[in-house]
Structures are given as C-alpha cells and as structure tokens.
C-alpha cells in the first residue's frame, strides 16, 4: 500500500486518504460515498444488501 504521490494503487483499487491505504473498488458497492470510490470506475454501484 502506497503513500500518496508514489506509485498508484494496484488495478481495481483506489487510494483512501481517510484510511491512508489503497482500498478495493469492489467495496464501493457497500460504501459508495467512500473517498476511495472517487478514484474508481464511474459506473454506478449495484444496489447493496439492504
């Protein structure tokens, strides 16, 4: 997991300043408002569990 300004996160993940780590874009289905999701694909998340 990289610090901001170094190599980007691996494919399918995006940097979260809140958590200070790369986060899986898959998590945006559950947490679409996460700061990491700003860097993920623009497709809208599928409806989540509830």
């Amino acid at each position: 997991e990289q610090a901001p300004g170094t190599a980007p996160c691996s494919r399918g993940s995006s940097w979260s300043a809140d958590l200070d780590k790369c986060m899986d874009c898959a998590s945006c289905r559950a947490r679409p408002h996460s700061d990491a999701c700003l860097g993920c694909a623009a497709a809208p998340p599928a409806p989540f569990r509830l």
Partner: antibody, heavy 119, light 111 residues
Framework: QVQLQQSGGGLVQPGGSMKLSCIAS????????MSWVRQSPEKGLEWVAE??????????HYAESVKGKFTISRDDSKSRFFLQMNNLRAEDTGIYYC??????????WGQGTDLTVSS | DIVMTQTPASLAVSLGQRATISCRAS??????????MHWYQQKPGQPPKLLIK???SLESGVPARFSGSGSGTDFTLNIHPVEEDDTATYYC?????????FGGGTKLEIK
C-alpha cells in the same frame, strides 16, 4: 500493528446475560464496520451482528437467531465495541470473535472468547 | 439466506501437489464486475485468517501459492504447491447481502 483484544465470556446459566468487549488498536477504528462472529461444532462459523460507522449512521444488523436478544454497540472515542447478550440459551454456546470489516470481508480478528451456556 | 456449500469436507494432499476446494452459493453473488466471495484459513486455536477477497484478489502477505477463481455461484480455492504449514480448515464467505454466511469448511491434511 493491528490488534483486537477481547474480554468477557465464560460460563452462564440459561436465561442469563453476558457482555463481550473488544478493544481495537493499530487501524482507523472509526472508519470500519465491526462485527461479532461465533463458531461452534454444530453450526460452524456464524455471523452474529454488525455495527457500521458514523458515516453510515451507526446502523446495526443482526442474524435472525439473535434479533431481540443481542445488542451491538461501539464507542469510537475509545476504539472499542460490545455485544450485550441476554436470554442466553444452550445454542448460543461457542467461541465468539470480534472482527472488523471495511465493507465485505472480515479483515482483522480478535483472539476469540469462549461462552458456555449451561446449568 | 444464501447457503454456502463447500466440498469436499476433508481432503488429504501430498506435499507439493495441488489442493482444490470448491464453494457453491445458493444464488449468484457476482455483479458484472466483482464477485463478493472471500476465503479464510483457520488453524486450531486461532481465529480465521483472510486469504482471498472478491473471489480472486490475494490478501497482502498471503503466499502466491494460494489462488481463487469463479463467479456467479461456483468458486474455487487452489493451493499449489501445498506445504506442511497449509494444514488447516478453509472457509468461504459471501458478502452479497445480510446475513453474511460461511461455508461449512474443508479440512486439509498434508500427506
């Protein structure tokens, strides 16, 4: 270094109550959803309850088998969370683990604590 | 609730060979992009440890001998080559909806 330190558990009589605690360190506790997962030879690994983060309005969810009996809560200021268990029955016996999840998978786990419900 | 069925219940594999564990969900746990299936390893007296997230993404620090695949309802965990230290019980778990449910486990023994 991430740690989830559990306390509570032990022997309790049927119909009794018990409170489990979990203190977290080494990660951004307030941003994570927290769960309790239990394990028994009869039922294997079983998710019990979840409490989400402040940004998710501290929403809580429970397994059907514990709804109305168990209450999950958290204290972000002290990086700890709890499971209050009431009206315990023999089928609640097992090892209880606290665990953190950002969204989907159980990332960090406590060491586990034994609960035995027996007269 | 989504029922997770793991096979086999137990497995004995020779050192250096391949171990294959299957997990079937009672309904799809995948979108067009991601599968909400995860794998854990548990050794006696220890909590489960995350190995694979989202069906095929290796958790940080987990050896590349572990790999996951599948989508929809059918998923597989492969370990190759197996090592002595891989003796454990392996579980799948979905996060498609609440309640999250786990498979019944596969106990791996190394011959």
């Amino acid at each position: 270094q991430v740690q989830l330190q559990q306390s509570g558990g032990g022997l309790v009589q049927p119909g009794g109550s018990m409170k489990l605690s979990c203190i977290a360190s080494g990660f951004t506790f307030s941003s994570y959803w927290m769960s309790w997962v239990r394990q028994s030879p009869e039922k294997g690994l079983e998710w019990v309850a979840e409490i989400r983060s402040k940004s998710d309005n501290y929403a809580t969810h429970y397994a059907e088998s514990v709804k109305g009996k168990f209450t999950i809560s958290r204290d972000d200021s002290k990086s700890r969370f709890f499971l209050q268990m009431n009206n315990l029955r023999a089928e609640d016996t097992g090892i209880y683990y606290c665990s953190s999840t950002y969204a989907d998978y159980f990332h960090y786990w406590g060491q586990g604590t034994d609960l035995t419900v027996s007269s | 609730d989504i029922v997770m069925t793991q096979t086999p219940a137990s497995l004995a594999v020779s050192l250096g060979q391949r171990a294959t564990i299957s997990c079937r969900a009672s309904q799809s746990v995948s979108t067009s992009t991601y599968s909400y299936m995860h794998w854990y390893q548990q050794k006696p007296g220890q909590p489960p440890k995350l190995l694979i997230k989202y069906a095929s993404s290796l958790e940080s620090g987990v050896p590349a001998r572990f790999s996951g695949s599948g989508s929809g309802t059918d998923f597989t965990l492969n370990i190759h080559p197996v090592e002595e230290d891989d003796t454990a019980t392996y579980y799948c778990q979905h996060s498609w909806e609440i309640p999250y449910t786990f498979g019944g486990g596969t106990k791996l023994e190394i011959k």
